[in-house]
Amino acid sequence: AYRPSETLCGGELVDTLQFVCGDRGFYFSRPASRVSRRSRGIVEECCFRSCDLALLETYCATPAKSE
């Protein structure tokens, strides 16, 4: 089970993303913002340091539809 904040790498990271994002799918990197000018991916944010559920969800491909 996913803990509130932990390090996720490799297949474990992929499995968790698939669980969190479901049918929406996910991507490993987001476009760089105008502020940072650099892209940073889920690998850096979750394998190289602890990440939480909210951060994982930002890598889901499309927003979940509200009921």
Epitope: C9, G10, G41, V43, C47, F48, R49
Partner: antibody, heavy 119, light 111 residues
């Protein structure tokens, strides 16, 4: 247990492209993160780049314009290409693996291969 | 000049305790990125010694330990032995460079 073996020419001419291959045994290339690191003679370690089997890559900004890391899953190999080399690229080149059990630490390394850039 | 700063050399007598520091900044260690330590014996490839700031891979003696506080980390070696003589490197991720970074390395001499 994953094992890595680097291979490639030991001598490359200036302005040419350095090409190295890392052969993976004891594990699938479709499971982990794969890195290249180099060490110039008598100096410290320098990270070149890494990739995740999904195709996600990240390169050292100082080398980014010259570096390509690619994978051949059918041969369980990944490779490094460094273009327009100079004498400053002379180094021992290591491939390494992050299996994911070590929080991003590179827990498996090849023995290294020495590349000299000289005409 | 490395992004992560280590002392070029440290030394100690057999049985003593030595520490090696690794000083970073708010864009790497201070940003919460894990610190890893590697041991490189003469003429060999680096070996992962400490991962995730303070964890030892299997096979690494408990004489080796790591810690992290703020923007720096340190490696401690107790009960120093002759075969601990090696180069030691810290490694982390830097968000400003958007890449992995190594310290410049520290040569440990056992007197």
């Amino acid at each position: 247990q994953v094992q890595l073996q680097e291979s490639g020419p030991g001598l490359v001419k200036p302005s040419e492209t350095l090409s190295l291959t890392c052969t993976v045994s004891g594990g699938s290339i479709s499971s982990y993160y794969w890195s290249w690191i180099r060490q110039p003679p008598g100096k410290g370690l320098e990270w070149i780049g890494y990739f995740f089997y999904s195709g996600y890559t990240n390169y050292n900004p100082s080398l980014k314009s010259r570096v390509t890391i690619s994978v051949d899953t059918s041969k369980n190999q990944f490779s490094l290409k460094l273009s327009s080399v100079t004498a400053a690229d002379t180094a021992v080149y290591y491939c390494a693996c992050i299996t994911g059990t070590t929080k991003g630490g590179m827990d498996v390394w090849g023995q290294g291969t020495t590349v000299t850039v000289s005409s | 000049q490395s992004v992560l700063t280590q002392p070029p050399s440290v030394s100690g007598a057999p049985g003593q305790r030595v520490t090696i520091s690794c000083t970073g900044s708010s864009s790497n260690i201070g940003a919460g990125y894990d610190v890893h330590w590697y041991q490189q014996l003469p003429g060999t490839a680096p070996k992962l010694l400490i991962y995730g700031n303070n964890n030892r891979p299997s096979g690494v003696p408990d004489r080796f330990s790591g810690s992290k506080s703020g923007t720096s980390a340190s490696l401690a070696i107790t009960g120093l032995q002759a075969d601990d003589e090696a180069d030691y490197y810290c490694q982390s991720f830097d968000s400003s460079l958007s890449g992995s970074v190594f310290g410049g390395g520290t040569k440990l001499t056992v007197l």
